[in-house]
């Protein structure tokens, strides 16, 4: 039988009524445009409603925007536009929220094509009140804030100026010219590419990076023939083009650009690309784009440093530039990734690596799934997950993977049973213990979100007809009641819950569509009194996350130590509430192998757990860069993974040696770089 | 170029019955709401139908509630309007209009088809 | 259903002068779902105003819309001859749709 449909599954009792008193509906007056919702704070119940409208194939004859408010998480709203004296607001801009619970809000506003410069109206109390102001340039990009004080502002003019603002932009400062790019960096400071010549994109790698550490007052030049930068936890990176020819290398500096050291990956041509997938405080996940027009690369590994790589995964799914990459970081569980290959063959398989990288492997078939007609043996195949590159290829998916930090170990996601990705309609699949193991959760596709960090799962199917039926479950997908939560089906546009998955509220957001009009409208229901006690110690059990094989001594042991923790049991139906906290209890293991990556110029064959030396590189003395000198490798073959936290047991021995030579390939040397103050 | 020809009126008897069509051109039919407007010889202009693009939400003027059906075809971008139980007071000229947008005004209009009820 | 009531029912005016016609709703009106029409004899009606104040693909800037609530305006700011003609307002806020009775301008 289909998931849910089972005779053993606990109704939850009364839920009809309960859910009934807790749903509201707000039908939003204006002729339906386009909407955008921005949850402002943290727990604070504060969510802003953008809605916009202009004809069709007119230029902005016609155009209307109006701002709603809700203080109760979606139950209520109330129009503020006059707060914003019932301006136009551009939505590419989007509305821009100030970090962490400063209550802060920027909108961008259309303006008329004389004016000397742009519009925004500022809050800074959650939206409670606005107050206008007129620019003296006209913006290019949102404005952005920085990590560290939500007073201080960046923008790009339409004119390419790098524009300041250290009073929450009550005044503006245009602190240099000619500028690309520009990003916030830590402790308040500021990177950006400016060009010398004609513009961005005729002196795409001929660009210079520069630093700002006190919002203008003085510069300092860290870099020439830029072709892009990134930032990615504490690494700063530069593509930087080759002096002989068109290629370009990765330079990566953890000292805000000071000093810089050769990434020891491939060149990349004109056509090619790099990417970072991931980045945090420990390692990077690089992709790097094959030669040719194959949507495919190669996935590499950092150490702590960020210089020296290894291979992690070939053939990995990268369509373009900008384009499609499955890659996705399963926040549920440590260490775990999923993305997708691109077979000889060309078809597209899912991969899952549990160990941040080191290893790679095809998902486990779910126990209640037939293999599908993709599949040459029907008992053997695998689960292959639907994400990015599947709904740009417009198939059936109207979601992503989904995880969720405080809902240890659930992942969800659209996908097929069989050998490769199936175009066919795909089901939904979760797993309970961070992508080891797979159930059908649900029949053809839905919308799905987490709510009271994975006490209840909240979904929505997906249907080119009207709805009016939510779908939930208090026991991580394995049984399903179904509420009709309004009378007249609505064109279902999107569920939103506060992100952090903590909140008990969903919002079902649509359309009514008559010969009329077609109007915005949204029902929000409060699941607070189907979960109606708090969670108590009994309803938790001890997990062991990564466990494999409980008679091992080292099972549950990823990247040196292992982790307990307390879980909600399924058959619990209680709230763990906004103040949930994941306890966990962590135990370091000994160094093994797999505690160790390959170093440089050395690689695992396939199901190996030994590093082996590249053929190309033996006998060969390894020598690399780093800070601009080149450094002599002593190695046999490993280096500890970065945030491996083992001891004892197995010691590779690693030695560098530094051979007090400047390396000529380092673009990015000391003496190429200068200062200058305002 | 974005066209409506109506076609189907005539004389007839009161109490007879008569179907209006609606031939559309030059835009995507099947995204939008259409209308049935009429207007009697010599005065204003009175709304008389509406249906939604998919035909699921329909409206109608009380003056001809229960004696006029709406419809449409997307797929032979028509739209119909089959009047029965004809009155005097339905004689008029018959157009078919296309809203601008989702709940906008009428920025397209047809040439009209007279109907004429008489004995 | 919302009543609009368009005043006067006949404006005699020359070529040149200053046209203003009022619509005044039964209740409440969003602009947004305010139009505008002119119909010539013979001829189906036409686009000239939507929201109460944006003008339609390729109305000439002598004509303008105003108003909110229960009270609309058109104006014609100089007569052209081709100007003469019966002006219709309409609401598309609320079923049923509703049409003014029309306001006939005429030359003098």
């Known amino acids: 039988s289909a998931p849910g449909e089972d005779e053993e599954c606990g109704r939850v009792r009364d839920f009809v009524a309960k859910l009934a008193n807790n749903t509201h509906q707000h039908v939003f007056d204006d002729l339906r445009g386009s909407v955008s919702l921005s949850w402002v704070g943290d727990s604070t119940g504060v969510i802003l409603v953008l809605t916009t409208f202009h004809v069709p194939l007119v230029i902005m004859t016609f155009g209307q925007s109006k701002l709603y408010r809700s203080e109760d998480y979606g139950k209520n709203f109330k129009d503020i536009t006059d707060l914003i004296n019932n301006t136009f607001i551009r939505t590419e801009f989007g509305m821009a929220i100030g970090p962490e619970n400063s209550g802060k809000v920027v909108l961008t506003a259309e303006v008329s094509g004389g004016s000397r410069g742009g519009r925004i109206f500022r809050s800074s109390d959650f939206a409670k009140n606005f107050v206008q102001t007129d620019l003296p340039f006209h913006p290019l990009t949102q404005m952005m804030y920085s990590p560290q004080n939500s007073d201080y502002l960046l923008a790009l003019s339409t004119e390419n100026g790098l524009w300041v603002s250290k009073n929450f932009g009550g005044k503006w400062e245009e602190i240099h010219k000619a500028v690309c790019l520009a990003k916030w960096g830590s402790d308040n400071t500021i990177f950006f590419t400016t060009y010398a010549n004609g513009s961005c994109k005729a002196d795409l790698g001929a660009l210079e990076l520069w630093r700002t550490s006190d919002l203008g007052k003085s510069f300092k030049t860290i870099g020439v023939k830029i072709y892009s930068f990134g930032l990615g936890g504490r690494f700063l990176f530069a593509s930087v083009m080759a002096d002989k020819d068109t290629t370009r290398r990765i330079h990566v500096s953890t000292d805000q650009g000071d000093t810089w050291s050769m990434a020891q990956l491939p060149s990349v041509g004109q056509e090619q690309f790099y990417s970072i997938l991931a980045a945090n405080d420990d390692m990077v996940f690089m992709h790097v784009d094959e030669p040719g027009d194959t949507g495919f690369g190669t996935i590499f590994t950092s150490d702590d440093r960020g210089i020296v790589y290894s291979k992690s995964l070939d053939r990995h799914l990268y369509t373009t530039t900008g384009g499609e990459t499955d890659f996705t970081n399963v926040t549920s569980l440590r260490g775990v990734y999923i993305t997708s290959v691109l077979s000889e063959d060309n078809s597209i398989q899912t991969m899952i690596t549990f160990d941040q990288g080191g290893r790679w492997t095809h998902l486990r078939k779910p126990e209640n799934s037939e293999c599908d007609a993709t599949a040459k043996n029907k008992n053997e195949c695998s689960l292959h997950i639907h994400a990015s590159y599947s709904i740009s290829q417009k198939l059936n998916v109207p979601m992503a993977p989904l995880s969720e930090p405080n809902a240890v170990g659930i992942v969800i996601a659209h996908g097929s049973v069989g050998d490769a990705i199936s175009v066919m309609v795909p089901d939904v699949y979760i797993s309970d213990d961070g992508g080891y193991s797979w159930t059908k959760m649900l029949e053809g596709p839905h919308y799905y979100t987490i709510l009271d960090s994975g006490g209840i799962i909240v979904a929505i199917e997906h249907s080119s007809r009207p709805i009016n039926v939510i779908k939930f479950s208090t026991d991580e997908g394995q049984c399903w009641q179904t509420y009709t939560f309004t009378r007249d089906p609505i064109y279902f546009t999107g569920l939103a819950s506060e992100p952090g998955a903590r909140s008990m509220n969903i919002s079902i957001w649509g359309f009514t569509e008559s010969f009329l009009t077609s109007q915005w409208v949204s029902y929000t229901i409060d699941f607070k009194d189907i979960l109606e006690r708090n969670c108590e110690e009994k309803d938790y059990t001890i997990w062991l996350a990564h466990s494999t094989d409980p008679e091992d001594y080292e099972d549950g042991c990823i990247l040196g130590y292992k982790e307990q923790f307390l879980r909600l049991r399924k058959s619990s139906v209680c709230q763990n509430g906004r103040d949930y906290v994941v306890t966990k209890q962590p135990s370091i293991c000994l160094c093994s192998l797999e505690d160790f990556l390959c170093d440089f110029g050395y690689y695992r064959p396939e199901n190996d757990s030994k590093c082996v030396e590249q053929p190309e590189l033996k006998g060969h003395d390894l020598e690399f860069c780093l800070y601009g000198r080149e450094e002599h490798l002593t190695t046999n073959g490993y280096r500890k993974i970065p945030g491996d936290k083992c001891q004892g047991g197995v010691n590779p021995v690693r030695e560098v040696k530094d051979l007090k030579k400047k390396c000529t390939s380092n673009f990015l040397s000391p003496e190429k770089q200068n200062s200058k103050s305002n | 170029e974005v066209q409506l020809v109506e076609s189907g009126g005539g004389l007839v008897q009161p109490g007879r019955s008569l179907r209006l069509s609606c031939a559309a051109s030059?835009?995507?039919?099947?995204?939008?709401?259409m209308h049935w407007v009429r207007q009697a010889p010599g005065k204003g202009l009175e709304w008389v139908s509406g249906i939604s693009w998919n035909s699921g939400s329909i409206g109608y003027a009380d003056s001809v509630k229960g004696r006029f059906t709406i419809s449409r075809d997307n797929a032979k971008n028509s739209l119909y309007l089959q009047m029965n139980s004809l009155r005097a007071e339905d004689t008029a000229l018959y157009y078919c209009a296309k809203p601008l947008y989702r709940g906008g005004p009428f920025d397209i209009w047809g040439q009209g088809t007279m109907v004429t009820v008489s004995s | 259903e919302i009543v609009l009531t368009q005043s006067p029912g006949t404006l005699s005016l020359s070529p040149g002068e200053r046209a203003t016609l009022s619509c005044r709703a039964s209740?409440?009106?969003?602009?947004?779902?305010l139009a505008w029409y002119q119909q010539k004899p013979g001829q189906a009606p036409r686009l000239l105003i939507y929201?109460?104040?944006s003008r339609a693909t390729g109305i000439p800037d002598r004509f303008s819309g105003s108003g909110s609530g229960t009270d609309f305006t058109l104006t014609i700011s100089r007569l052209e001859p081709e100007d003469f003609a019966v002006y219709y307002c309409q609401q598309v806020a609320v079923s049923p749709i509703t049409f003014g009775g029309g306001t006939k301008v005429e030359i003098k």
């Open positions: 030059g835009f995507t039919f099947g995204d939008y709401a």
């Open positions: 929201g109460a104040s």
């Open positions: 209740q409440s009106v969003s602009s947004s779902y």
